[in-house]
């Protein structure tokens, strides 16, 4: 979390922004809140990024003012505006891509004074993983696949019963590029289970961490997955 | 050549669900945001709703929020439309759009368009 | 919502003159603004984009303009095929959305 002030103290606001993580490929939000005030149009929000010279997104006067908006960000920004008056003034990112990664300034002018926060947005690729039983394999094998990851993960396989177990030797991890060439799918196959058992697929880079669960008993097979983001810091 | 092949269209009583799909090729499918637009019979354009290119994310029209579903196959090249609740002001010719690459928000590819028609 | 509204609704002009249409948006929308034309029974087809940006395998005489709320499309020496019915798009936002269109008729 990152509170910012605004420069004189007597006309300075409180400014909020959250760290956050973006999907390549996929529309990301860019936290930021700030002390609201009563009327719309003396609002402005603009949105910096350190390094590129034009806005990323300005918001003034009830409505988005786009004149000085960065050609890399054509078409992509667009702020909640029915929540600006309630001190909302988050970005919505469409399509996220790799190059958007880097240092953002959420800059807020109100009738109460100025403020503004930085916020570290790193983008990458996630996605949840899916555990199967490989029925095409020699032994009781299990496959985990999720289709979209970057920077390339680490994949740990874990058991209910043999906790602690390294699973390494009897475990094949392989990575394949998309046809983005950036993301990549990850597969990793882990040999010799045994039934009765819960198996965890761990996939972990330094943007996000998913984990696909499976228990196979005679009767059933029961799945479970989740995905949490690592770097959700408030500033 | 790329091409959108729209299908799913028909006639559907009021409160009818139907599901739209729209079977892609000639292009990397899931590099590109998709959308559908339609058109009501001698309307203009309406956009209805969009999905990233992973799937992950979508964005609806005011007009069928939370009754459309919009959804991608990226394994099947197939993009869908899950429609609810229809209604007779949904009846129009519902066409598949490919949304430029670099940048977003305007329709390089159209399919041909499926026809719904909502009516008792 | 940014609502476009495109003028006149019908133009009716001879093969060989020049036609201007015109998209008028409600709030400023820079120069996120493309054109479509649209024959009978067909799909749309892009022209234009970010306004006055060509596509390639659109002839030449198609141009575009303007920025801010006014954006005009120009065909410099009409064609037969060019009768069709002509939509701008707004482009700017999540929501997106089409002019009224402009119907251009043989006189």
């Known amino acids: 979390l990152i509170i910012g002030f605004g420069i004189s103290g007597r006309h300075s606001i409180t400014v909020t922004t959250v760290a956050s993580a973006g999907n390549i490929g996929e529309d990301g939000i860019l936290s930021c809140t700030f002390e609201p005030d009563i009327k719309l149009s003396d609002i402005v929000i603009q949105w910096l990024k350190e390094g590129v010279l034009g806005l990323v997104h300005e918001f003034k006067e009830g409505k988005d003012e786009l004149s000085e908006q960065d050609e890399m960000f054509r078409g992509r920004t667009a702020v909640f505006a029915d929540q600006v008056i309630v001190g909302n003034a988050s970005l919505r990112l469409k399509n996220v891509q790799l190059t958007d990664a880097g240092t953002y300034k959420c800059y807020i002018i109100t009738s109460k004074g100025k403020g503004n926060a930085n916020l570290e947005y790193k983008t990458g690729a996630f996605s949840m993983p899916e555990v199967n039983v490989d029925y095409n394999a020699s032994s009781e094998t299990l496959r985990c696949e999720a289709p979209r990851w970057f920077p390339q993960p680490t994949v740990v396989w874990a058991s209910q019963v043999d906790q602690g177990a390294n699973f390494s030797e009897v475990s094949n991890t392989s990575f394949e590029l998309n046809s983005e060439n950036v993301t990549m799918k990850v597969v990793s196959v882990l040999y010799n289970v045994t039934i009765n058992n819960t198996y965890s697929c761990m996939i972990e880079n330094d943007i996000a961490k998913a984990t696909g669960d499976i228990k196979v008993t005679e009767s059933e097979i029961k799945r479970r997955s989740h995905l949490q983001l690592l770097n959700s810091k408030a500033s | 050549e790329v091409q959108l092949v729209e299908s799913g269209g028909g006639l559907v009583q009021p409160g009818g669900s139907l599901r739209l799909s729209c079977a892609a090729s000639g292009f990397t499918f899931s590099n590109y945001y998709m959308s559908w637009v339609r058109q009501a019979p001698g309307k203009g354009l309406e956009w209805v709703a969009y999905?990233?290119?992973?799937?992950?994310?979508?964005y609806y029209s005011d007009s069928v929020k939370g009754r459309f579903t919009i959804s991608r196959d990226n394994a099947k090249n197939t993009l869908y439309l899950q429609m609810s609740s229809l209604r007779a002001e949904d009846t129009a010719v519902y066409y598949c759009a490919r949304e430029s690459y670099s940048q977003g928000n305007y329709f390089d590819y159209w399919g041909q368009g499926t026809t719904v028609t909502v009516s008792s | 919502e940014i609502v476009l509204t495109q003028s006149p609704a019908t133009l009716s002009l001879s093969p060989g003159e020049r036609a201007t249409l015109s998209c008028r948006a409600s709030q400023s929308i820079s120069d996120y603004l493309h054109w479509y034309q649209q024959k009978p029974g067909q799909a749309p087809r892009l022209l234009i984009y970010?306004?006055?940006q060509s596509i390639s395998g659109i002839p030449a005489r198609f141009s575009g303009s303007g920025s801010g709320t006014d954006f005009t499309l120009t065909i410099s020496s009409l064609e037969p095929e060019d009768f069709a019915v002509y939509y701008c798009q707004n482009g700017h936002s999540f929501s997106l959305t089409f002019g009224q269109g402009t119907k251009l008729e043989i006189k």
């Open positions: 970010f306004a006055s």
């Open positions: 999905v990233s290119s992973g799937g992950g994310s979508t």
